[in-house]
Amino acid sequence: ITQQDLAPQQRAAPQQKRSSPSEGLCPPGHHISEDGRDCISCKYGQDYSTHWNDLLFCLRCTRCDSGEVELSPCTTTRNTVCQCEEGTFREEDSPEMCRKCRTGCPRGMVKVGDCTPWSDIECVHKESGTKHSGEVPAVEETVTSSPGTPASPCSLSG
């Protein structure tokens, strides 16, 4: 596919600023024009680009889901930063949703880590000190915990 093969029909907002690409790339906060001669500004609060690029389109800003709080808004060069609400967390293997933190540890275990926006409470066996992993069995005795204080943001894109 040659670059010249692209023939766009672009309804660019009048306020979108244009500048010239550097070696075929546009700076963060911009995308490249159809003919490759211009860099077109992303739309603030709507889309963004984070790196030098030759993208036809800026990327859409993430919108925080219910159950999330917005730590920082989307700019033309940075996506929205969302974080799970207090008492919930996001796991690496299921990043699309926030899950409720457990309120306590299973019987025979003690809590060694608080609930944070990116991790559930951490439980270890009283005697061995080994961590508990996997689903929690029915909680017979629990050690209650209060949600942890956020220490760093959890950023999602797309």
Partner: nanobody, 124 residues
Framework: EVQLLESGGGEVQPGGSLRLSCAAS????????MSWFRQAPGKGLEFVSA????????YYAESVKGRFTISRDNAKNTLYLQMSSLRAEDTAVYYC?????????????????WGQGTLVTVKP
């Protein structure tokens, strides 16, 4: 995970029209840019057209400019390609793709998903 399913292909005479659809399921594609590619028999994949997530910026390959129109309905999670004034050289399997964006030349950027394709045959 996004699944894309193309439909609307078929056999048509030169000068005729067809409308291809690409239905997305599994997850909304309203956050994604979308595009159509095609592969003619014995040829490589060719970029046809692309549309940004908001549907307000479109790109067309020179070979289809003025004849093809790309559009999307985010409420229906569907991408369309209206093809008119069809020519024999438009004969190909047409694929839709969703990606965070597309680079100049058509290469997908970021997460991307592809359909299985629908065959368009243009012959007298």
């Amino acid at each position: 995970e996004v699944q894309l399913l193309e439909s609307g292909g078929g056999e048509v005479q030169p000068g005729g029209s067809l409308r291809l659809s690409c239905a997305a399921s599994g997850r909304t594609v309203s956050n994604y840019a979308m595009s159509w590619f095609r592969q003619a028999p014995g040829k490589g994949l060719e970029f046809v057209s692309a549309l940004n997530w908001g549907g307000d910026t479109t790109y067309y390959a020179e070979s289809v400019k003025g004849r093809f129109t790309i559009s999307r309905d985010n409420a229906k999670n569907t991408l369309y390609l209206q093809m008119s004034s069809l020519r024999a050289e438009d004969t190909a399997v047409y694929y839709c793709a969703a990606a965070q964006s597309f680079r100049r030349g058509g290469a997908p950027y970021g997460d991307n998903y592809w359909g299985q394709g629908t065959l368009v045959t243009v012959k007298p």
